[in-house]
């Protein structure tokens, strides 16, 4: 049998049953999530659930830039260091950079310091690039 790989929206890239859109415009975390949702298909800020997924995403983004952090779908809505993915995925894989998680930093970004393989927490009202994800 021929199995057709699902297609992603123009400009989005495909990896392991998911489509990803890397948006190079500046949005705060909540506006970024709203923009992801506006694309339909159940899109949200991206959850990153394995090293393989993280590596694929990091390699893709490094082709575009290597200096600006990027919002992902991990946040701490209760502000109690109880992190969760906005798309409801299980928070099992973690890749924090090891920086202090204190202060008013309750949203997660892919850090450019380690080629986007590790995460840092940041203030949610900061405007940054963002990564969306949906399953086609």
């Amino acid at each position: 049998d021929i199995i057709m790989r699902p297609s992603c929206a123009p400009g989005w890239f495909y990896h392991k049953s998911n489509c990803y859109g890397y948006f190079r415009k500046l949005r705060n975390w909540s506006d970024a999530e709203l923009e992801c949702q506006s694309y339909g298909n159940g899109a949200h800020l991206a959850s990153i659930l394995s090293l393989k997924e993280a590596s694929t995403i990091a390699e893709y983004i490094s082709g575009y830039q290597r200096s600006q952090p990027i919002w992902i779908g991990l946040h701490d809505p209760q502000k109690r260091q109880q992190w969760q993915w906005i798309d409801g995925a299980m928070y099992l894989y973690r890749s924090w950079s090891g920086k202090s998680m204190g202060g008013n930093k309750h949203c997660a970004e892919m850090s450019s310091n380690n080629n986007f393989l590790t995460w840092s927490s940041n203030e949610c009202n900061k405007r940054q690039h963002f990564l969306c994800k949906y399953r086609p």
């Epitope: 989005w12 190079r24 415009k25 506006s38 575009y64 405007r127």
Partner: antibody, heavy 120, light 110 residues
Framework: EVQLVQSGAEVEKPGASVKVSCKVS????????MHWVRQAPGQGLEWMGR????????NYAQKFQGRVTMTRDTSISTVYMELSRLRSDDTALYFC?????????????WGKGTTVTVSS | QSVLTQPASVSGSPGQSITISCTGT?????????VSWYQQHPGKAPKLMIY???KRPSGVSNRFSGSKSGNTASLTISRLQAEDEADYYC??????????FGGGTKLTVL
């Protein structure tokens, strides 16, 4: 259908200012950056700057810093480009263009252009 | 003076292939996958032909292709047709978060 509708031709005197508008329809106004690009008669394209309609943030080409101001009115889905202290070499066709929601980093929708003539 | 360098003109016969180059620096063309190409017919607005160096928007013929090597991007048009006669411009994102254009190349189909 996405449309960028620009204001009509302008004739201005040297030293004056001109304000060109670009009205958006067919997509979420606050979703896309809007850029302004000009083209002098018989010349190439020149990027002037861009505005983020969501927040009003701007980024201008160094050449136009201090002379150009880009603004927006979200209530009527319109962006504006004002160029002050006009000179004869500002005579050009002025285009607004969008960059497709930040995915392409390219200008995939263009207005038809507004002719600005600077003459005494 | 344009930041990106393009040949002023190129020409080719119908059915042939031509390539237009666009040379910048590591701060623009060489530093990013952000090169785009535009076609402009006289009196018309430019039309996006290639984005991110080598990707075609829907509706653009597969006769148009883009590539990049180092600080130079290229647009290739295969199987030239009369309607391809136009001006072509490259553009790139820069390290200052600005955009720059090349000076433009006039394509003549002989």
């Amino acid at each position: 259908e996405v449309q960028l509708v620009q204001s009509g031709a302008e004739v201005e005197k040297p030293g004056a200012s001109v304000k060109v508008s670009c009205k958006v329809s067919g997509y979420t106004f606050t979703g896309d950056y809007m850029h302004w690009v000009r083209q002098a008669p018989g010349q190439g394209l020149e990027w002037m700057g861009r505005i983020d309609p969501k927040y009003g943030d701007t980024n201008y080409a160094q050449k136009f810093q201090g002379r150009v101001t880009m603004t927006r009115d979200t209530s009527i889905s319109t962006v504006y480009m004002e160029l002050s202290r006009l000179r004869s070499d500002d005579t050009a066709l002025y285009f607004c263009a969008t960059d497709n929601s930040g995915l392409y980093d390219a200008f995939d929708k263009w207005g038809k252009g507004t002719t600005v003539t600077v003459s005494s | 003076q344009s930041v990106l360098t393009q040949p002023a003109s190129v020409s080719g016969s119908p059915g042939q292939s031509i390539t237009i180059s666009c040379t910048g620096t590591s701060s623009d063309v060489g530093g990013y996958n952000y090169v785009s190409w535009y076609q402009q017919h006289p009196g018309k607005a430019p039309k996006l032909m290639i984005y991110e160096g080598s990707k075609r928007p829907s509706g653009v013929s597969n006769r148009f292709s883009g590539s990049k090597s180092g600080n130079t991007a290229s647009l290739t048009i295969s199987r030239l047709q009369a309607e391809d006669e136009a001006d072509y411009y490259c553009s790139s994102y820069t390290t200052r978060s600005t955009r720059v254009f090349g000076g433009g190349t006039k394509l003549t189909v002989l």
